[in-house]
């Protein structure tokens, strides 16, 4: 999980002739706001999920009134960043749409009116955790300057935010195959429920057990860099088996335009001509407004006061989808291993581990005996998440530190007398009994019941119990 952050630096007329008319006037003061929509760069987006990675709206900027006769300057901007939280892995390659909206503040009936001033779109590569990337995009006569970055939310780390960090379970080491979590050296990496061994840097998963590779990587665990040297075409996704880039589809293959839109190729991408009632880069936005109550499960509807402007549903924890229609039951995937209890806290999953197991998903079987010493010659025995000591004779307690009274349990049968001895205990048997614990009666004919007494021991002699 993490956050994509967008900082708008300026929005104003681009260089060159044909400067645009100011969007605001003395008669019609207005203010700007921005909408960003993110999609994973290589995904086949369904029409019902227009912004599969997320979307955000900025605050409204300061009110602006055009000075008569002055050219359109850079327009005053809203404060702060646009933040798009993402729940899963950061995909590395993403598509963005940034829309500049004008809110007119005149005396029109029914409150302010919104209209779309400019829309820019692009596709970029970006590693989470990296520095701010700067960009300039032009839309008609307008120019938008902005910076963006993706950062992971703790406990996630890494270029795809797929590695988790957790406090160390032992002071000196992380579990098998897990490294310290730079820069949090006192924490350890922990895997998600992706396929075991999936590269934390170059792989991620959307379904438990799978290992999907970020662009430029291949192999079952995304540990093999894609090599283009032996390939004919540099375009397209990598083939799992060869690690080659194989020819990919053209921009209009499979028609990326939703809702009956028609696609035409442009030199760098494609363009959709949308039917009435739909708009957006892929005709993915319909003329539904917030007045229609499109957000389910308590989702908050933002924007969309008229059919020409988009709405966004901000979903409460536990719901997702463009209309908050999908319940997220992350515990149904049973992510906690080894019988751990799954807790969905809304903002995060937690596993409560059984004794003897650790890790964000209880995936590590603790070495119960590691660093545990049993005193006085005792040996450590692992079991069920707790160590226990098998103590040498004469010692007891959890760590064999206590002197045991071997006679306390009255081990000598049939009235035998017990004596503590450096190597254990000794039973002095009553007449008519023999054995280490005086357990065998002596027969009248002088023969003993099995087992036979060792040679040289007469019935009645004290016998040491070793």
């Amino acid at each position: 999980a993490g956050v994509f952050e967008l900082q708008i630096h300026s929005f104003g007329p681009g260089p060159g002739p044909g400067a645009p008319r100011s969007p605001c006037s003395a008669r019609l003061p207005c203010r700007l706001f921005f909408r960003v929509c993110l999609k994973p760069g290589l995904s086949e987006e369904a029409a019902e999920s227009p912004c599969a990675l997320g979307a955000a709206l900025s605050a409204r900027g300061p009110v602006y009134t055009e000075q008569p006769g002055a050219p359109a300057p850079d327009l005053p901007l809203p404060d702060g960043l646009l933040q798009v939280p993402f729940r899963d892995a950061w995909p590395g390659t993403f598509s963005f749409i940034i829309e500049t909206w004008r809110e007119e503040l005149g005396d029109q009936i029914g409150g302010p009116a919104w209209s779309l001033l400019a829309r820019v779109a692009g596709r970029r590569r970006l590693a989470a955790g990296g520095p701010w990337a700067r960009d300039i995009q032009r839309a008609g006569a307008w120019e938008l300057r902005f910076s963006y970055r993706a950062r992971c939310e703790p406990p996630a780390v890494g270029t795809a935010c797929t590695r988790l960090c957790r406090p160390r379970s032992a002071p000196s080491r992380c579990g098998p195959g897990l490294r310290p979590c730079a820069p949090l050296e006192d924490e350890c990496e922990a895997p998600l429920v992706c396929r075991a061994g999936c590269s934390p840097e170059h792989g991620f998963c959307e379904q438990p057990g799978e290992c999907r590779c970020l662009e430029g990587w291949t192999g079952p665990l995304c540990t093999v860099p894609v090599s283009t040297s032996s390939c004919l075409s540099p375009r397209g996704p990598s083939s799992a088996t060869t690690g080659c880039l194989v020819p990919g589809p053209g921009p209009c293959d499979g028609n990326p335009c939703a809702n009956g839109g028609s696609c035409s190729e442009t030199p760098r991408s494609f363009e959709c001509t949308c039917p009435r009632g739909f708009y957006g880069l892929r005709c993915e936005v319909s003329g539904v407004t917030c007045a229609d109550g499109p957000c389910f499960n308590g989702g908050l509807c933002v924007g969309g006061a008229d059919p020409d402007s988009a709405y966004i549903c901000h979903c409460p924890p536990g719901f997702q989808g463009s209309n908050c229609e999908k319940r997220v039951d992350r515990c149904s995937l049973q992510p906690c291993r080894n019988g751990g209890l799954c807790l969905d806290l809304g903002h995060a999953l937690r596993c409560r581990c059984r004794a003897g197991f650790a890790g964000p998903r209880c995936e590590h079987d603790l070495d119960d005996c590691a660093g545990r010493a049993c005193a006085n010659g005792g040996t450590c025995v692992e079991g069920g998440g707790a160590h226990r000591c098998s103590c040498a004779l004469g010692f007891g307690g959890r760590d064999c530190r206590e002197r045991a009274d071997p006679c306390a349990a009255r081990p000598c049968a049939h009235g035998g007398r017990c004596y503590a001895h450096f190597s254990g205990l000794v039973c002095a048997c009553a007449p008519g009994y023999m054995g280490a614990r005086c357990e065998f009666p002596v027969h009248p004919d002088g023969a003993s019941a099995l087992p036979a007494a060792p040679p040289g021991l007469r019935p009645g002699d004290p016998q040491r119990y070793l």
Partner: antibody, heavy 118, light 107 residues
Framework: QVQLVQSGAEVKKPGASVKVSCKAT????????IEWVRQAPGQGLEWMGE????????VYNEKFKDRVTMTVDTSTSTVYMELSSLRSEDTAVYYC???????????WGQGTLVTVSS | DIQMTQSPSTLSASVGDRVTITCKAS??????VAWYQQKPGKAPKALIY???YRYSGVPSRFSGSGSGTEFTLTISSLQPDDFATYYC?????????FGQGTKLEIK
């Protein structure tokens, strides 16, 4: 305790097909790849392919790509491996194995002997 | 395909001996190597993953090491139960490939 139980031995004629089943118990079936490995008599191990039950995604060894099909029945937690156009050199013990919580084939079925003979 | 070449093919040793089996990959496989033990008529059993990590329940006398193209499996003190065939396997690239096996027999 994780168990993979395979179907019984089969005798097939050259050109026929065989479908071996592997029933999984005591773990979250959909979350772990099932691998198929075969071993000809007196020979080593040869990987045939894998399937992730939760998604149905398969990866096949190029050597078997045109003849092997792996499928899954989630209702019974069973994976199937079908090999067609059998030849005598396909006589082998066929194993299913589970890619476990660590990076290796952690649990194995008992094996299914497939004999191809005219 | 990546070739995994094991040596020796057969190894004779006695109970209590320390034995080492090596496995060479035809190209870099990082640490994506596992080791398995197989007894006649039985399915293989997992021993080592990620080149050097013991699978749960595997006795501590088994250890693995190596990275890149050279890997070793060491049994520090042979027990009667250890006489079997051992296979290395790479899972860095498709198709997964196994070594041809090393048969460990009683001297």
């Amino acid at each position: 305790q994780v168990q993979l139980v395979q179907s019984g031995a089969e005798v097939k004629k050259p050109g026929a097909s065989v479908k071996v089943s592997c029933k999984a118990t005591d773990y979250i079936f959909s979350n772990y790849y099932i691998e198929w490995v075969r071993q000809a008599p007196g020979q080593g191990l040869e990987w045939m392919g894998e399937i992730l039950p939760g998604t149905g995604n398969t990866v096949y060894n190029e050597k078997f790509k045109d003849r092997v099909t792996m499928t899954v029945d989630t209702s019974t937690s069973t994976v199937y491996m079908e090999l067609s156009s059998l030849r005598s050199e396909d006589t082998a013990v066929y194993y299913c194995a589970r890619w476990g919580d660590y990076a290796l084939f952690a649990n194995w079925g008992q094996g299914t002997l497939v004999t191809v003979s005219s | 395909d990546i070739q995994m070449t094991q040596s020796p093919s057969t190894l004779s040793a006695s109970v209590g001996d320390r034995v080492t089996i090596t496995c060479k990959a035809s190209q870099n496989v990082g640490t994506n190597v596992a080791w398995y033990q197989q007894k006649p008529g039985k399915a293989p059993k997992a021993l080592i993953y990620s080149a050097s990590y013991r699978y749960s329940g595997v006795p501590s006398r088994f250890s693995g090491s190596g990275s890149g193209t050279e890997f070793t499996l060491t049994i520090s003190s042979l027990q009667p139960d250890d006489f079997a065939t051992y296979y290395c396997q790479q899972y860095n690239s498709y198709p997964f490939t196994f070594g041809q096996g090393t048969k460990l027999e009683i001297k």
